[in-house]
């Protein structure tokens, strides 16, 4: 017998949709082989209608799809707009139609329940609004208009033009009678409940001349949209609930085993601690739509999510909702990168950020997650060179090592730098990742002077001391700018006004500026790296002043612990949040913008790993 399993019989009605789940043993071969849905013909052959390789038959175009969930050993065939012609015998299977593993499914599409002649069918999701149209003749224009609900053999009055409203519909129903000449009245029911489902009767007038019209109202729970994302990646839930609730509090919740819904985040400031540092709710557009981004996806994030609107910021019956079923694929294309990076006060961290390697030209960004209200993520640095002012001289985004990873270096760390940061690009939004920076006890490994004042026209020598453990690392000095950190040429690259020399015995790498010019003023970094992977850095600010006394100047290592004055300016920052999105590149369907080339002179570096999930910064 076949190990493939599914529903043997599926019964539905015309116009409806079906979602057929087929289960298979999730072996490596099965997970990756072709999945198909085919219809058995009289000849016994099974004609493919839709497959996991993207094929959709003309008969199914625009109304069917097949989604494979290899982690769960499941694939799902969705078919919409069913007609009686869809009734028949089908197979869902793996491999080749004729000799693969398969399961027989019988689909029966019927006409639906017998409804009175001329019945109008309204199919609406729970929480939404329906407008029932009720025509009448001229002679009934002045007479009472009413809507009844048929319950068994009886009719229960729901609303009428004499201001009666059934208590079950209080505050969510209205009857509209148009001006003269229009022979139709409407009944609008808001915030539909499952219990509103059923047959209704419009009536105008009474006696034998009355006008009647039947309406069949189907209230459905929204079909969850299947969302399949990679472990460590990012998911965006786009929630459009309609203008009726544009000014009502919004929420995203996750359905638990008791079938209640735990708030993940809402616009009233509530947020589940399990999503700390990795969730943003983007302010809504004028139409009331909003989106929620979750990064650093974990296996335990799987489940059914609902977004909705209610003044309490949580799920309530009869209010509009949208649903998703999130699956997290453990066979992720997103590489493992440390989720926690540790550094010491005064030291530095080098953060590795993954991006889709197919999008090497995409713009790269790094932002600081802020938990206030719905969360926001102001950009701190981008590959085109913008650096937020208060990070001047201590933050750089490097394109290295490339091929799916870029590097962000932050030095002169303080306890205020602890927090969550997001790596992102203007390309594939699913590759957004989160890293937490922790400031731990310890001393920086690299020692440089604090503020250095150089004299115009003279020689300046700045020492950078490093411990023995870095003796095998490449040492470098670079001049920081907001487009990166330009490595300064070393001595053996020929004569230069600025060169690096290194006395390995004294574990010292020095920067020499000779002669000092006005252009030399600015931030300099001393750093270590291995190939394209960067390690620690230390920063020093060089101020240039007019000559006062003759002679050369050497900065003593004794001054190496003074820190430069830090400028902290609150500049108007772009952020990942959707006030017209201030930077439209940062959300969803962004265009890939050609990069301006390699931004930084240096190469890029790996860091000491404390564990597979943690990356050490400036201290061992």
């Amino acid at each position: 017998k076949s190990p493939v399993f599914g529903p043997q019989e599926v019964s539905s009605v015309e116009g409806n949709s079906v979602s057929i789940k087929c289960y298979y043993p999730p072996t490596s071969v099965n997970r990756h082989t072709r999945k198909y849905w085919c219809r058995k013909g009289a000849s016994g052959r099974c004609i493919t209608l839709v497959s996991s390789e993207g094929y959709v038959s003309s008969n199914y175009a625009g109304r069917a799809n097949l989604t494979n969930f290899p982690e769960n050993g499941t694939f799902v065939v969705n078919i919409a707009q069913l007609s009686r012609d869809d009734s028949g015998h089908y197979k869902c299977g793996l491999g080749i139609n004729s000799r693969g593993l398969s399961f027989d499914v019988s689909l029966e599409v019927s006409q639906g329940p017998e409804l009175p002649n001329g019945t109008e069918v309204y199919t609406v999701d729970v929480g939404r609004t329906v407008t029932i149209k009720c025509p009448f003749k001229t002679e009934n224009a002045p007479k009472t208009k009413a809507l009844y609900k048929k319950i068994g053999q009886t009719s229960v009055l729901v609303i009428d033009s004499r201001n009666y409203v059934n208590p079950n519909y209080k505050d969510r129903i209205r009857l509209r009678i148009p001006g003269t000449g229009q022979l139709i009245f409407t009944v609008v029911i808001d915030r539909l409940r499952l219990s509103d489902h059923g047959l209704y009767l419009c009536q105008a007038g009474d006696g034998s001349n009355r006008d009647e019209k039947n309406a069949d109202l189907q209230v459905l729970e929204p079909e969850p949209e299947l969302v399949y994302e990679d472990l460590r990646g990012s998911v965006t839930f786009h929630c459009a609930l309609g203008l009726e609730v544009a000014n009502v509090a919004k929420f995203l919740c996750r359905v638990n085993s008791r079938e209640t819904c735990d708030v993940v985040i809402n616009t009233l400031g509530k947020r589940d601690s399990a999503f700390e540092g990795r969730i943003l709710l983007n302010p809504q557009d004028k139409d009331g739509s909003f989106s929620v981004v979750i990064t650093g996806l974990r296996k335990e994030d799987e489940g059914r999510y609902l977004c909705g609107a209610h003044s309490d910021g949580q799920l309530q019956e009869g209010w509009p909702i949208q649903a998703w079923q999130l699956f997290v694929n453990e066979e992720s294309t997103i590489p493992r990168s440390p989720t926690v990076v540790k550094g010491v006060a005064g030291g530095s961290v080098a953060v590795l950020c993954p991006y889709n390697p197919k999008e090497s030209q995409s713009l790269k960004y790094w932002c600081l997650w802020e938990g206030a209200q719905n969360g926001r993520c102001p950009l701190l640095v981008e590959s085109q060179g913008l650096v937020q002012e208060q990070y001047e001289g201590r933050l750089s985004l490097l394109q290295e090592p490339g091929n799916g990873t870029f590097t962000v270096i932050l030095n002169q760390l303080t306890t205020q730098d602890a927090g969550f940061y997001w790596c992102l690009t203007n390309g594939d939004t699913r590759w957004r990742t989160t890293v937490e920076i922790k400031i731990i006890e310890g001393e920086p490994n690299l020692k440089v002077p604090g503020n250095v004042t150089a004299v115009l026209g003279e020689t300046l020598n700045i020492p950078c001391h490093f411990p023995c453990k870095f003796s095998s690392y490449e040492k470098y000095w670079c001049k920081w700018s907001n487009t990166g950190c330009q490595t300064l040429p070393s001595q053996d690259e020929g004569p230069s006004e600025a060169f690096v020399n290194c006395d390995e015995n004294s574990r010292l790498v020095s920067l020499t500026l000779n002669p000092v010019t006005r252009a030399d003023e600015g931030w300099y970094w001393c750093g270590v790296k291995q190939g394209h992977f960067y390690g620690e850095t230390a920063a020093v600010y060089v101020a240039v002043e007019e000559k006062k006394v003759a002679g050369s100047r050497y900065v003593s290592p004794a001054k190496a612990d003074a820190a430069p004055d830090e400028k902290v300016l609150d500049s108007g920052v772009r952020e990942i949040e959707n006030k017209a999105i201030q930077d439209p590149r940062l959300f969803a369907e962004e265009k890939v913008v050609a990069d301006t080339g390699d931004q930084a002179g240096g190469s890029r570096a790996s860091v000491d790993s404390s564990s597979s999930e943690e990356q050490g910064g400036s201290s061992k």
């Epitope: 019989e9 019964s11 539905s12 009605v13 057929i20």
Partner: nanobody, 127 residues
Framework: EVQLVESGGGLVQPGGSLRLSCVAS????????MAWFAQAPGKEREFVAA??????????YYSDSVKGRFTVSGDNAKRTLDLQMKDLNPEDTALYFC??????????????????WGQGTQVTVSS
């Protein structure tokens, strides 16, 4: 509180028929899945048949051992589940449990994918 109550079990001769019924009260949501599992003495609970509803669509699942002999039916609005059992044989002897879940998530054959259970009704097939 959700309650499931089974009925219809009894003693029947091989080749005979029996109809089991289950009523679920208090089951949340408008979609649901209900199933029958059988537990023979000293054995694990085994999947027999299930039916899942969503709107006006129903999905019926059967184990290989009962295909063609047993028919599952029910009414989502009334939260009822029936199992028509024909051509019974002694291997069908077991305690039959009704199970329910508020939605159609997870493989219907796996007992862990059902949140609510009845107390069971005994079916004995013997001459």
């Amino acid at each position: 509180e959700v309650q499931l109550v089974e009925s219809g079990g009894g003693l029947v001769q091989p080749g005979g028929s029996l109809r089991l019924s289950c009523v679920a009260s208090g089951l949340p949501g408008s979609s649901s899945r209900m199933a029958w599992f059988a537990q023979a003495p000293g054995k694990e609970r085994e999947f027999v048949a299930a039916i899942a509803w969503r709107g006006r669509t129903s999905y019926k699942y059967y184990s290989d051992s009962v295909k063609g002999r047993f028919t599952v039916s029910g009414d989502n609005a009334k939260r009822t589940l029936d199992l028509q059992m024909k051509d019974l044989n002694p291997e069908d002897t077991a305690l039959y449990f009704c199970a329910a879940h508020p939605n159609d998530d997870g493989d219907p054959r796996i007992s862990g994918n059902y949140q609510y259970w009845g107390q069971g009704t005994q079916v004995t097939v013997s001459s």
